[in-house]
């Protein structure tokens, strides 16, 4: 049995920040689980991890330098990514693993979410002041 995951097809990060919600066909509240967000078609970069155990507080961390936070719903985990760079525009995949009680469960690979990071549009200031009029 595999858990099904639903994600928005595309999100735009206007202020270099975005909320990505991973919706599961599974209630996580009475489980020990590891929810993670992966970057790239090959999911090579583990962006953020939310570790949950029904009797303890959520642990949220990134080992790859991303600024992230996570929130748990009974059938969802929302990742809040901040300080994203334009060059981090990519496809991001939600992954879920139920560690306990057994048996171990994980998800069918989702379609992913393209996160398009739009940099802040700041008015460019000239490097050199123009010639001053007499």
């Amino acid at each position: 049995n595999k858990i099904l995951v639903k994600q928005s097809p595309m999100l735009v990060a206007y202020d270099n920040a975005v909320n990505l919600s991973c919706k599961y066909s599974y209630n996580l509240f009475s489980r020990e689980f590891r929810a993670s967000l992966h970057k790239g078609l090959d999911s090579a970069v583990e962006v953020c991890v939310v570790y949950g155990n029904y009797s303890q507080q959520l642990q949220v961390y990134s080992k790859t330098g991303f600024n992230c936070d996570g929130k748990l719903g009974n059938e969802s985990v929302t990742f809040y990514l901040q300080n994203l760079y334009v060059n981090q525009t990519d496809i991001y995949f939600c992954k879920i693993e139920v560690m306990y009680p057994p048996p171990y469960l994980d998800n069918e690979k989702s379609n992913g979410t393209i996160i398009h990071v739009k940099g802040k549009h700041l008015c460019p200031s000239p490097l050199f002041p123009g010639p001053s009029k007499p």
Epitope: N1, S25, Y26, N27, L28, F29, S30, R31, Y54, S55, N74, E75, V98, P101, P102, P103, L105
Partner: antibody, heavy 120, light 107 residues
Framework: VKLQQSGAELVKPGASVRLSCKAS????????IHWIKLRSGQGLEWIGW????????QYNAKFKGKATLTADKSSSTVYMELTGLTSEDSAVYFC??????????????WGQGTMVTVSS | DIQMTQSPASLSVSVGETVTITCRTN??????LAWYQQKQGKSPQLLIY???HLVEGVPSRFSGSGSGTQYSLKITSLQSEDFGNYYC?????????FGGGTKLEIK
């Protein structure tokens, strides 16, 4: 899915007994088996569970030292051994399969029960 | 450990009536609760899981409700085959305690 339990037992105080629960109709190593006690005139009491896939076990603290859960994968059987028997252990013991309903647990399949009578 | 308080302990009713059995817990179990029916000399039978979900094949006169720490099993238009013992059980960690049971008798 079928859980077939061993027959009734008449045992002396202080002795031990091993009850069996033979599973069929599903992949034995993929489901947790729970054990439950029912004493005459009283309610159901949860003893513990056993997961044959990894030999993971959880006991009710009340039954630690009283019940020991094991399994034999080759015969798809879970066992419960009860030691140091007293009249308090006279009861019907059920095994039941835990199913995971998308993250919510329940026991939809039960064995027929094994009656244990402790008497000298 | 989670404490399960089931009430009433016994109930004497007539065929056709409606009954409600309640189960209270000492902490939030987030709907991780099942209800069982057990008849004399038989194994328990699962009626409801996840507090509100009726098991396939169980008559629709049975229904479960509740959330947080308070849950109920309602049986409408009682039939003669509904008499017996009823138990709730939580699955919020271990031990997976049962309620004390409710004996439903014919008046």
């Amino acid at each position: 899915v079928k859980l077939q339990q061993s027959g009734a037992e008449l045992v002396k105080p202080g002795a031990s007994v091993r009850l069996s629960c033979k599973a069929s109709g599903y992949t034995f190593t993929e489901y947790i088996i729970h054990w439950i006690k029912l004493r005459s005139g009283q309610g159901l009491e949860w003893i513990g569970w056993f997961y044959p896939g990894s030999n993971d076990i959880q006991y009710n603290a009340k039954f630690k030292g009283k019940a020991t859960l094991t399994a034999d994968k080759s015969s798809s059987t879970v066992y419960m051994e009860l030691t140091g028997l007293t009249s308090e252990d006279s009861a019907v013991y059920f095994c039941a399969r835990r199913d995971d309903f998308s993250g919510y647990d329940a026991l939809p399949y039960w064995g027929q029960g094994t009656m244990v009578t402790v008497s000298s | 450990d989670i404490q399960m308080t089931q009430s009433p302990a016994s109930l004497s009713v007539s065929v056709g009536e409606t009954v409600t059995i309640t189960c209270r817990t000492n902490e939030n179990i987030y709907s991780n609760l099942a209800w069982y029916q057990q008849k004399q000399g038989k194994s328990p039978q699962l009626l409801i899981y996840a507090a509100t979900h009726l098991v396939e094949g169980v008559p629709s006169r049975f229904s479960g409700s509740g959330s947080g720490t308070q849950y109920s099993l309602k049986i409408t238009s009682l039939q003669s085959e509904d008499f017996g013992n009823y138990y709730c059980q939580h699955f919020w960690g271990t031990p997976c305690t049962f309620g004390g049971g409710t004996k439903l008798e014919i008046k």
